[in-house]
Amino acid sequence: SGTTNTVAAYNLTWKSTNFKTILEWEPKPVNQVYTVQISTKSGDWKSKCFYTTDTECDLTDEIVKDVKQTYLARVFSYPAGNVESTGSAGEPLYENSPEFTPYLETNLGQPTIQSFEQVGTKVNVTVEDERTLVRRNNTFLSLRDVFGKDLIYTLYYWKDSSTGRKTNTTHTNEFLIDVDKGENYCFSVQAVIPSRTVNRKSTDSPVECMGQEKGEFRE
């Protein structure tokens, strides 16, 4: 069904990192425009990206209202210059996205090591608590605020002079590890949500090594 010379969107794909969420689709429009709708299972459809020639739509503002809900989006196709026109069913062509549950599926962004501090044979490594676009009481929540104990960080660390790598985990954003005195160490961290079945791990943070600007050293 559908209007002559319009084609339905296809390959609808969610791209989401730390809850910043974009719906992408194909094809690039030729003589047609798109409107996107998004809804939870309530069926209260909200229109976004009206009559656009883009093939992506930022739906972050909608999904951050409740990241634990499951969302569906649909992309409507209209003839350019005649958006009131409908198909033989009396409705424009449309296609549904896959279901998307942000809390379970948003990719974990690459973390950043905020600082590390050595005191004797111990090093405290702090991971930056990244701000998300999820709001509560008009303030933006951090990744830790949203995920709580579901989120852990894994620390990988090794002596500058060695290839042997050690690991440590934390349910907070801080690690306290034992090191050998007089040795320089390098660090990388990874965000993990162990309870997930997909998108469980972030990419590794950039490597930070002792003796560089992020560190503090105290005897």
């Epitope: 809804s39 309530s42 209260d44 569906l72 033989s88 549904n96």
Partner: antibody
Framework: EVQLLESGGGLVQPGGSLRLSCAAS????????MSWVRQAPGKGLEWVSS????????YYTDSVKGRFTISRDNSKNTLYLQMNSLRAEDTAVYYC???????????WGQGTLVTVSS | DIQMTQSPPSLSASAGDRVTITCRAS??????LAWYQQKPEKAPKSLIY???SLQSGVPSRFSGSGSGTDFTLTISSLQPEDFATYYC?????????FGQGTKLEIK
Amino acid sequence: EVQLLESGGGLVQPGGSLRLSCAASGFTFSNYAMSWVRQAPGKGLEWVSSISGSGDYTYYTDSVKGRFTISRDNSKNTLYLQMNSLRAEDTAVYYCARSPWGYYLDSWGQGTLVTVSS
Amino acid sequence: DIQMTQSPPSLSASAGDRVTITCRASQGISSRLAWYQQKPEKAPKSLIYAASSLQSGVPSRFSGSGSGTDFTLTISSLQPEDFATYYCQQYNSYPYTFGQGTKLEIK
């Protein structure tokens, strides 16, 4: 466990009115669209009406438009179908069903029989 | 309105058989199709949505396929509890419509 329990069916004369209720439990009622589907004796299924979780959007099959009104009370976890100007052809078992996105029907009640006869 | 035509209207089969029921829409509905099972004097039960997605708790012997106008429900190995009437339903556009049903009987 999702439970839907219809009530309010019975015998009514042509031209009469009836209000069906559907009490929902086991899920967050306001998070789901809901629907009514009917089945005349010995016949197949017929979609009647749907309503969004907020109650802002309602939809009807042509044969009941202007006669039936779907509504919901999210504070009571209850779905309603107000049926006016009833006709013999409205005789059926009426099922309430949960309807994710207002699309398919993933959980059904046991049904309530409405008989329109003089 | 979109018409949904199921075939066959009735079907006799034995436990262990592989059974296929088809549903044809009068116009394209993409994958916006559901399948239901109904036993006598009981409410329908959801089996499949989005043409091929299995409803939670439904045995894996049930599967759905198709897109556009032609759809199938397959039961890979019939069990005694599968003898029932099966309905397809389109949810592409209002008014939503059902097929007339396929009655699956014991041979």
